[in-house]
């Protein structure tokens, strides 16, 4: 269920859940918001100061990288 994630616990969870995609500590500008002036929401606000489930955590994963063929 939802839990608070701070410090190393938060980095661990992001690393494991996001994997190859990597992650953001702040959502990119405009991510999930129609207003360019909306304040940036940070994962520390959402997951450390408040409880955070896995789906919320996944919102901070970076987009899929378009990998080039080797």
């Amino acid at each position: 269920g939802p839990e608070t994630l701070c410090g190393a616990e938060l980095v661990d969870a992001l690393q494991f859940v996001c994997g190859d995609r990597g992650f953001y500590f702040n959502k990119p500008t405009g991510y999930g918001s129609s207003s360019r002036r909306a304040p940036q929401t940070g994962i520390v606000d959402e997951c450390c100061f408040r409880s955070c489930d896995l789906r919320r955590l996944e919102m901070y994963c970076a987009p899929l990288k378009p990998a080039k063929s080797a």
Epitope: E3, L5, A8, E9, D12, A13, Q15, F16, V17, C18, G19, D20, R21, L54, E58, L64, K65, P66, A67, A70
Partner: antibody, heavy 118, light 106 residues
Framework: EVHLVESGGGLVQPGRSLKLSCAAS????????MTWVRQAPTKGLEWVAY????????YYRDSVKGRFTISRDNAKSTLYLQMDSLRSEDTATYYC???????????WGQGTLVTVSS | EIVLTQSPTTMAASPGEKVTITCRAS?????MHWFQQKSGTSPKPWIY???KLASGVPDRFSGSGSGTSYSLTISSMEAEDAATYYC?????????FGAGTKLELK
Amino acid sequence: EVHLVESGGGLVQPGRSLKLSCAASGFTFSNYYMTWVRQAPTKGLEWVAYISSGGGSTYYRDSVKGRFTISRDNAKSTLYLQMDSLRSEDTATYYCTTEDYGYWFAYWGQGTLVTVSS
Amino acid sequence: EIVLTQSPTTMAASPGEKVTITCRASSSVSYMHWFQQKSGTSPKPWIYGTSKLASGVPDRFSGSGSGTSYSLTISSMEAEDAATYYCLQRSSYPPTFGAGTKLELK
């Protein structure tokens, strides 16, 4: 050198419990998140559970949620998997694993076999 | 979750033969990773990030691909390459492995 040694496997009846252990050495255990991965006989690999470095965060595959509990004792450098309400489909070799960023599932123990049968 | 389908399931190759194992993902992934497992032993990391060989892996191995289609290639089969190979994706939670390709020596 990273060394992971699992123990606690064996034959158990459906519905019963078993607790697996994984003794870690050769690295700073408390700095790393840990996972369990299992492999059913003659089958592929399946991630089972995750626990953060401090033990405060856990994730499970859907089929074991509510039945399995992953935990750790950083003072003893030991990882655990408590398995309750065991089913025949839980029969597998269970591996303790850890990883570095980008080097996924880099380190594996030798595995411990759990057989669930009446 | 992303399903990884490996092909072939089993195959046999003669020494010196070129071998290609494929892994197809049900959705696009950034990279594919490969593991080698020999009977009675733990899986070993073999190829990371689609094409980077893990430490100690012979350079006759290579990896390639993008999107939903990836492959592991052995340029010239040797006896020690007989094993089961698994692909892994870490682009989407939860992590998932392919069912494996068993490579035998002919």
